[in-house]
């Protein structure tokens, strides 16, 4: 259902991009439903700091706090994940520093630690102490949720000691896990008490039971393992940008798209434009004009620059962009006031037009 | 899970056209493209072309925009690709593919007088 | 169009093996970059994006490298199960072309 007619067709691609977006994978931090989660805006020198979530502004509320530079999520949910960034706004300039929230049943990830210290969790009892199983290291096991990234190692342990010795096998979400559930297989340290899988993936998800027992007894301990996927995502643009904007007749006035993408982006900056005195085409979609768009003869795409604007000039604009995966855009308004009226603070104007998320 | 189902094979004739459907489901449809990308046999990938579902934007391989139709049906979360005038060489397997992270099982068009 | 060669367009190892396979592209594509592997009668999966990024579910055996014009993807240590042919992918511009592809067999 496509929802405008472009006056003037252009490629969605760039043919010589910019390379200044940051395209690397943010850092992850993950949380357990109902926890709290607290994360510091890594950026120096802040004057002020503003908080985004998945391109949205955000503000506090009963479980958001922001309190300087740090940001608190209260009784956080799976809604609450998502792409965050902070902004420090300066006196000269701003940067804006991204990171990934997840919020599943885990809350961190596996124990990727060597078993250098895996011999002293071999406990040897004395032979004529007959003895049920029991824990050695609980500290190694207070770890009960791990969310892990895709194709990364686990480790789970159960250090563990009885007399006579006794022997541990493990369980998948309470049934026998056996080599050939899942590709690659597991390897058993028996003498580290450790279940270790190699490449996770997401089918790899569930609860791993160690199951601990001698002729005297047996104890078990749960593990749930949550495979954290990791994909390219579509664009994602700062909030509140592009700012709406006035300026007299004759003045010049910039708009500014500020765009955080881990696949090539490409820009294009959009009006409303009039054609043979309509704005709407016979099917009734409103007419649009690519003004500017990333590639070879433009420079940097993330600013629209209009000089010597005309009241023509006013209306809304939009940026907008795309990647191979998605798009994203949002929109601006531009106020054209006669010669002799100076400019003051425009009133935000929020506009989305039908066809635009 | 993200699952992409295709519609099953099809034989034609040359200078007949095909749709081959794919049936999104598992995320939200609007937020990705979908591409086309078909196989001939023995042969290698071929990107055709993609569709945003979210407002219909389009982008085609030159080589195929004047014979493929891309359309979007949002309500059944459903993509199509329309090949028209078709000749033996677009005998293929037909791949559609939620912005090349996950792929449809795939379409074998055969064309054959 | 931005034209993809890859190479070799197929080879042969041992299983445990270091395996690399490159891919140039005509022009520089900034690290748009997509590897799959396709086994027969598969679909193609995604193994790397953005040049150097495994996929979800991708064992860590397979890496990708590169900027520019010039691309590289490395098994690590060859396993019977990646027997396939591995095809590279520019994702930065219209039309989205591929590479011919490497068929990687066992010796």
């Known amino acids: 259902r496509p929802s405008f007619s472009l006056v003037e067709d252009t490629t969605l691609e760039p043919e010589e991009p910019p390379t200044k977006y940051q395209i690397s994978q943010p850092e992850v931090y993950v949380a357990a439903p109902g926890e709290s989660l607290e994360v510091r805006c890594l950026l120096k020198d802040a004057a002020v700091i503003s908080w985004t979530k998945d391109g949205v502004h955000l503000g506090p509320n009963n479980r958001t706090v922001l309190i300087g530079e740090y940001l608190q999520i209260k009784g956080a949910t799976p809604r609450d994940s998502g792409l965050y960034a902070c902004t420090a706004s300066r006196t000269v300039d701003s940067e804006t520093w991204y990171f990934m929230v997840n919020v599943t049943d885990a809350i961190s990830s596996g124990d990727d630690e060597d078993d250098t210290d895996g011999a002293e969790d071999f406990v040897s009892e004395n032979s004529n102490n007959k003895r049920a199983p029991y824990w050695t290291n609980t500290e190694k096991m207070e770890k009960r949720l791990h969310a892990v990234p895709a194709a990364n190692t686990v480790k789970f342990r159960c250090p563990a000691g009885g007399n006579p010795m006794p022997t541990m096998r493990w369980l998948k979400n309470g049934k026998e896990f056996k080599q050939e559930h899942r590709i690659g297989g597991y390897k058993v340290r028996n003498q580290h008490w450790s279940l270790i899988m190699e490449s996770v993936v997401p089918s790899d998800k569930g609860n791993y039971t160690c199951v601990v027992e001698n002729e005297y007894g047996s104890i078990n301990h749960t593990y749930h393992l949550d495979v954290v996927e990791r994909s390219p995502h579509r664009p994602i643009l700062q909030a509140g940008l592009p700012a709406n904007a006035s300026t007299v007749v004759g003045g010049d006035v910039e708009f500014v798209c500020k765009v955080y993408s881990d696949a090539q982006p490409h820009i294009q900056w959009i009006k409303h434009v009039e054609k043979n005195g309509s704005k709407y085409g016979p099917d009734g979609l409103p007419y649009l004009k690519v003004l500017k768009h990333s590639g070879i003869n433009s420079s940097n795409a993330e600013v629209l620059a209009l000089f010597n604007v005309t009241e023509a000039d006013a209306g809304e604009y939009i940026c907008k962009v795309s990647n191979y995966i998605g798009q994203a855009n949002q929109s601006a308004w531009l106020t054209v006031l006669p010669k002799q009226q100076a400019p003051g603070r425009e009133k935000e104007i929020t506009a989305s037009p039908d066809y635009l998320e | 899970q993200v699952q992409l189902v295709q519609s099953g094979a099809e034989v034609k004739k040359p200078g007949a056209s095909v749709k081959v459907s794919c049936k999104a489901s598992g995320y939200t449809f609007t937020n990705y493209y979908i591409h086309w990308v078909r196989q001939a046999p023995g042969q290698g990938l071929e990107w055709m072309g993609a569709?945003?579902?979210?407002?219909?934007?389009?982008s085609y391989n030159q080589r195929f925009k004047v014979r493929a139709t891309l359309t979007a049906d949002t309500s059944t979360s459903t993509v199509y690709m329309e090949l028209s005038s078709l000749r033996s060489e677009d005998t293929a397997v037909y791949y559609c593919?939620?912005?090349?992270?996950?792929w449809g099982q795939g379409t074998t068009v055969t064309v054959s007088s | 169009d931005i034209q993809m060669t890859q190479s070799p367009s197929s080879l042969s190892a041992s299983v445990g093996d270091r395996v690399t396979i490159t891919c140039g592209a005509s022009?520089?594509?900034?690290?748009?970059l997509n590897w799959y592997q396709q086994k027969p009668g598969k679909a193609p999966k995604l193994l790397i994006y953005?040049?150097?990024n495994l996929a979800d579910g991708v064992p860590s055996r397979f890496s990708g490298s590169g900027s520019g014009t010039d691309y590289t993807l490395t098994i690590s240590s060859l396993q019977p199960e990646d027997v396939a042919t591995y095809y590279c992918q520019n994702v930065l511009s219209t039309p989205y072309t591929f590479g011919g592809g490497t068929k990687v067999e066992i010796k």
């Open positions: 593919a939620r912005a090349f992270t996950y």
């Open positions: 569709i945003y579902p979210d407002n219909g934007d389009t």
């Open positions: 022009e520089n594509i900034y690290g748009a």
């Open positions: 953005g040049a150097t």
